[in-house]
Interface confidence: low
């Protein structure tokens, strides 16, 4: 019988008392084969973290700073359940740390030196740790003691709880630096008042502070937020302009064998029986003998953290950067005006080989990071382990939902002004063998399908989105008799046609021979009835243009396109017979790397782009013998996006809506994780 006990860690006598009450009340409402609670008492949260890591306890609730400590080796804990605040309909699991300024003050985030600052309190998250952590490498050296460096950075501050004797500048705007509400500039509202009164130029608070202090929109409009990209935004645009997004209070568990499903089962049942307004005799979110015992008193319930989410992703790049800077106190030796090498994310072995060749040729401007799947690459870019990669539109959507931005677009047509003119897109098509003359768009049920990969534009999102509108369910593996859609569950009929060997079968990378455009077309040639690819795929792999044995004798005339009106047309008539227009592949990165990725990639394409005529003796960025490694092989140049610099603007309203509809069918664990951070 599996042990269904969750050992909860308590950090005080009062918490232990509440934990025992929790245990006893859960026993009274949960069947004997359900989850149960045991209580373990430790002296501190750090002791609890160590106990969970050592398998002496299973769970504890922590604030964000401690979630970071819990994640660090050797603890390796992960977030499993989040407390939420507000309503069940609009649950808030995060708050945003922001920098608020007056509208007419005219400076940006990178011009804070010499300004006057208002803080909620020394050592507090939104008011000190996050802003000072993010500014850390701009502080004058020596950076220790930190308070002295901060005092020398700003021209005057109010940082309640600071030592006014040793660091008088930190108390210049609020004499005495009192550490309670007796100091009018203490806490969130106090820091905002410090700005409002004109004592300071910037207030470091959380996003709700300004709304709590100014009910009138006209008053709020006198203030703006400083963004990390050195722009400003209105105060209600905090989701797109903040210093960090911070989880409020989170249950953590071991990453391996951590009982996360059991912990969720326990807490889900606990909130049903003892949540807000549920029971008189025991309340989960109430602390008669103290404050915030086990859980925050202000919490309204729990949400399960998606399993794909590790602590780094949960805490977010900005928060982790800020806390790491403060804890480790290390800054890069390079000055801020130098671009560090761009860490390119390469998928599997073949892309890594090409990337390494690029790295050597780039004289250290490009470094390579490997991952097994596109989603793993996106996650690495999010957390700073990698910086950039070029993505199909379907993954540009996921990357965008995860906070990344498009920076350059692949262009596929030769033009005089290639780099300045991003194209409208390419065509997603359905290809069949000419010999299968009875096959149309309307009778694909039961046929064998070939897809570039799950989640990609031409191979999945467009055809499956159209299909979903017809069949109104997500069971595509039942619609087709079998197929190859790399990235599907291994036991799915949509992995049956795939050709990868062993663990590589149906993997969404080049180890699966039927992956990507060329792979999906090969699948059609060798096994399938229909392939969902781009309009250039057939001509690129027929007429001897692809020398591989399976392709060298193929003839374009032996293939036709399926049109949505039920007719068929020759391959060259794609403009009048396609499923939809697809956005070109685009390079994505984090917002903070946007300028450098843009600059270095433009340098790189001048050196190794399509102006290189002999690819046998020279490195060519856009060539890989039809394997589309790192970039599509038909890329002519990487083009500026001009104002299409967000994923929504880049992909266009129509495509975003189409992918949004397909989200009900999404198997993307990363998309689930990212929409948890930003619904």
């Amino acid at each position: 019988v599996p042990d269904k006990t969750v050992r909860w860690c308590a950090v005080s006598e009062h918490e232990a008392t509440k934990c025992q009450s929790f245990r006893d009340h859960m026993k009274s409402v949960i069947p004997s084969d359900g989850p149960s609670v045991a209580c373990v008492k430790k002296a501190s949260y750090l002791d609890c973290i160590r106990a969970i890591a050592a398998n002496e306890a299973d769970a504890v609730t922590l604030d964000a700073g401690l979630v970071y400590d819990a994640y660090l080796a050797p603890n390796n804990l992960k977030p499993v359940v989040a407390e939420f605040y507000g309503s069940k309909e609009d649950p808030q699991t995060f708050y945003y740390a922001v920098a608020v300024v007056k509208k007419d003050s005219g400076f940006q985030m990178n011009q804070l030196r010499g300004k006057k600052s208002c803080h909620t309190g020394l050592g507090r998250s939104a008011g000190w740790n996050i802003p000072i952590g993010l500014l850390y490498c701009d502080l004058p050296e020596p950076r220790k003691p930190l308070e002295k460096a901060v005092a020398n950075f700003f021209s005057g501050s109010c940082a309640p709880c600071a030592d006014g004797t040793d660091f008088p500048q930190l108390c210049q705007l609020c004499p005495g630096c009192g550490c309670s509400t007796l100091n009018q500039y203490f806490g969130y509202s106090g820091a905002f008042k410090c700005l409002k009164d004109g004592a300071g130029d910037v207030a470091f608070v959380k996003h709700s502070t300004i709304f709590e202090n100014l009910a009138n929109k006209a008053d709020r409009d006198q203030y703006e937020l400083l963004c990390l990209d050195n722009t400003r935004k209105p105060v209600d645009e905090y989701k797109d302009c903040h210093l960090a997004q911070v989880p409020s209070h989170t249950v953590v568990a071991r990453s391996m064998g951590g009982k996360e499903d059991l912990i969720w089962e326990l807490l889900n049942q606990a909130q049903e029986h003892f949540g807000k307004d549920k029971s008189k005799e025991f309340q989960l979110f109430s602390s008669p003998h103290g404050k915030d015992l086990l859980f925050k008193d202000s919490a309204h319930g729990f949400l399960k953290v998606p399993p794909r989410m590790d602590a780094k992703m949960y805490l977010g790049y900005e928060y982790v950067t800020a806390i790491r800077n403060l804890r480790e106190g290390t800054c890069p030796e390079a000055p801020t005006d130098e671009c560090k090498p761009v860490k390119w994310c390469a998928l599997s072995h073949h892309e890594r080989l090409k990337c390494d060749e690029w790295s050597v040729n780039s004289v250290g401007k490009i470094e390579c990071v490997s991952a097994e799947t596109t989603e793993d690459c996106i996650a690495k870019i999010m957390n700073g382990e990698a910086d950039a990669m070029s993505l199909d539109g379907g993954f540009v959507y996921i990357a965008g939902k995860c906070g990344l931005v498009p920076v350059l677009a692949e262009n596929y047509n030769k033009s005089d002004n290639c780099e300045d003119t991003p194209e409208a897109g390419y065509f997603a098509i359905a290809v069949v063998k000419k010999s299968a003359s009875d096959l149309t768009w309307d009778n694909l049920k039961g046929k064998k399908s070939c897809h570039t990969a799950v989640g990609r534009t031409a191979g999945w999102n467009i055809p499956m989105g159209l299909l979903y509108n017809k069949i109104n369910h997500c069971r595509f593996d039942e619609f087709f008799s079998e197929g190859c859609a790399p990235g599907s569950k291994k036991d799915s009929s949509l992995c049956k046609l795939c050709m990868g060997s062993g663990l590589n079968l149906c993997e969404p990378n080049n180890k699966e021979g039927y992956y990507g455009y060329t792979g999906a077309f090969r699948c059609l040639v060798e096994k399938g009835d229909v392939a969902f690819v781009k309009h250039q795929t057939v001509p690129q792999n027929t007429g001897g243009k692809n020398p591989d044995p399976w392709a060298k004798n193929l003839n374009e005339k032996d293939y036709e396109l399926l049109c949505l009106d039920g007719t068929r047309k020759p391959v060259e008539e794609y403009a009048n017979c396609h499923l939809a227009r697809a956005p070109n592949h685009a390079v994505v990165t984090r917002k903070d790397k946007e300028a450098c990725v843009h600059k270095i990639l433009r340098q790189q394409q001048h050196l190794f782009g399509s102006n290189v005529t002999d690819c046998s003796g020279n490195f060519c960025l856009f060539r890989s013998e039809t394997k589309d490694l790192l970039f599509r092989d038909d890329t002519v140049c990487l083009a500026k996006l001009h104002d299409r610099n967000t994923y929504e603007k880049y992909l266009g309203e129509e495509y975003v809506k189409a992918v949004g509809n397909l989200r009900k069918c999404s198997t993307s664990s990363l998309l689930e994780a990212c929409t948890f951070r930003r619904p």
């Epitope: 030796e333 000055p335 801020t336 130098e338 004289v363 401007k365």
Partner: nanobody, 117 residues
Framework: EVQLVESGGGLVQPGGSLRLSCAAS????????MAWYRQAPGKGLEWVAG???????NYRDSVKGRFTISRDNSKNTMYLQMNSLRAEDTAVYYC???????????WGQGTLVTVSS
Amino acid sequence: EVQLVESGGGLVQPGGSLRLSCAASGSIFSIATMAWYRQAPGKGLEWVAGITRSGSTNYRDSVKGRFTISRDNSKNTMYLQMNSLRAEDTAVYYCTDYSSRYYHDYWGQGTLVTVSS
């Protein structure tokens, strides 16, 4: 303000040698990856060789084995030793920091190398 000054160009016969120097003022030199570029008459700019701050080097194929890039961080100077020169090496040679942010590249005024008999 960073300044880069190239010198050492001149007229040389095919098969001959030249040594170009690039002197950098300002702090950029000790931390940046440096590179030599060249521009032949009527042609576009092309990368010739690069050297990282730790001394790793790389060359375009057509100059490999003939040209050697080096740097002396204590003197804030980079060099390009060019041996077995050919007519097609005729160009204005520029040094650059190859890596500064937000498009503010630092370029010297160039030094002309003419290979002719």
